[in-house]
């Protein structure tokens, strides 16, 4: 059986947590880490469409960030492969009502955590 914890949503062998609270990007990742998870890593268009549909109209942080002049990277250190456009000039990415955008890390938003569902 798949083991998505209470309050997490299962989709394609992953579990997602959509916050009600708001935090900055760093604090959002710390929350996810406490749950043995990361800010969401989006691996397919189906996954992106699911997240956009499920999160509603609010902005939600995801696990993409960049240092000045550097490429976007996921939390796990892998480089972003331009699966979707990211608007804006910030260093951290979030999903809005149209797709992905970016903002400064200290701004507060809702967030999405993701982890693999652990089959037992």
């Amino acid at each position: 059986q798949a083991a998505c914890p209470e309050s997490w949503i299962g989709f394609q062998r992953k579990c997602f947590y959509f916050s009600d609270d708001t935090k900055n990007w760093t604090s959002s990742q710390r929350f996810c880490d406490s749950q043995d998870a990361d800010l969401a890593q989006v691996e397919s268009f189906q996954e992106l469409n699911f997240l956009l549909r499920y999160k509603g109209p609010s902005d939600h942080w995801i696990g993409l960030s960049r240092e000045q002049g550097q490429p976007w990277k996921w939390i796990n250190g892998t480089e972003w492969t331009r699966q979707f456009p990211i608007l804006g000039a910030g260093e951290c990415a979030y999903l809005n009502d149209k797709g992905a955008s970016s903002a400064r890390h200290y701004t507060e938003r809702k967030w999405i955590c993701s982890k693999s569902d652990i089959h037992v």
Partner: antibody
Framework: EVQLVQSGGGLVEPGGSLRLSCAAS????????MSWVRQAPGKGLEWVGR??????????DYAAPVQGRFTISRDDSKNTLYLQMDSLKTEDTAVYYC???????WGQGTLVTVSS | EIVLTQSPGTLSLSPGERATLSCRAS???????LAWYQQKPGQAPRLLIY???NRATGIPARFSGSGSGTEFTLTISSLQPDDFATYYC?????????FGQGTKVDIK
């Protein structure tokens, strides 16, 4: 039923090394973040460190007393977690447990005694 | 490093009584980052409560967790013979995940 079966404990002299193993079965080990926790005789629990899943980068974090001496690794092809302990001290004497915090799974524990 | 202090060190009660165990943090811990474990002699710990108030799978309803900030409580509403054990709180607010020193619940 989920199992975490530990091995590799024993008696070692101060300054010596030991490697503990934790073999996982009946869950998707490769997706799990795993931890080591220890308990000195008659004392409380002490977190040793943890390793993330490969998809989360496979990174490790350690408690201050073991940083630089202990190394956590994993072999997902063998469903096995490891704790390499080097430069062992008498105060490292404890029962060592492997665990998956998120699901509440724990190994049976293995005793490591550091003594001359 | 966040230090967790549990009190009392030992709690002597009779079966059927209510047990209230305290866990105080040296700095604020989000309620999402605190767990409680039960341990019996010679056994591995057992997860009781995660995220301060959520019961783990298979844990009876007599166990409940509450609190926020720096003060957290584990309550056992009516002690059963099987509940006499040592209880630990653990925080996972920081990347070093510390435990309290434990509270032993023994039979009066």
């Amino acid at each position: 039923e989920v199992q975490l079966v530990q091995s590799g404990g024993g008696l070692v002299e101060p300054g010596g090394s030991l490697r503990l193993s934790c073999a996982a079965s009946r869950f998707t080990f490769s997706d799990a973040w795993m931890s080591w926790v220890r308990q000195a005789p008659g004392k409380g629990l002490e977190w040793v460190g943890r390793i993330k899943s490969k998809i989360s980068g496979g990174t490790t974090d350690y408690a201050a007393p073991v940083q630089g001496r202990f190394t956590i690794s994993r072999d997902d092809s063998k469903n096995t977690l490891y704790l390499q302990m080097d430069s062992l001290k008498t105060e490292d004497t404890a029962v060592y447990y492997c665990a998956n915090r998120n699901l509440g799974y724990w190994g049976q524990g293995t005793l490591v005694t550091v003594s001359s | 490093e966040i230090v967790l202090t549990q009190s009392p060190g030992t709690l002597s009660l009779s079966p059927g009584e209510r047990a209230t165990l305290s866990c105080r943090a040296s700095q604020s811990v989000s309620s999402s980052y605190l767990a409680w474990y039960q341990q019996k002699p010679g056994q591995a710990p057992r997860l009781l409560i995660y995220d301060a108030s959520n019961r783990a799978t298979g844990i009876p309803a007599r166990f409940s967790g509450s609190g926020s900030g720096t003060e957290f409580t584990l309550t056992i509403s009516s002690l059963q013979p099987d509940d006499f054990a040592t209880y630990y709180c653990q925080q996972y607010n920081s990347y070093s995940r510390t435990f309290g020193q434990g509270t032993k619940v023994d039979i009066k």
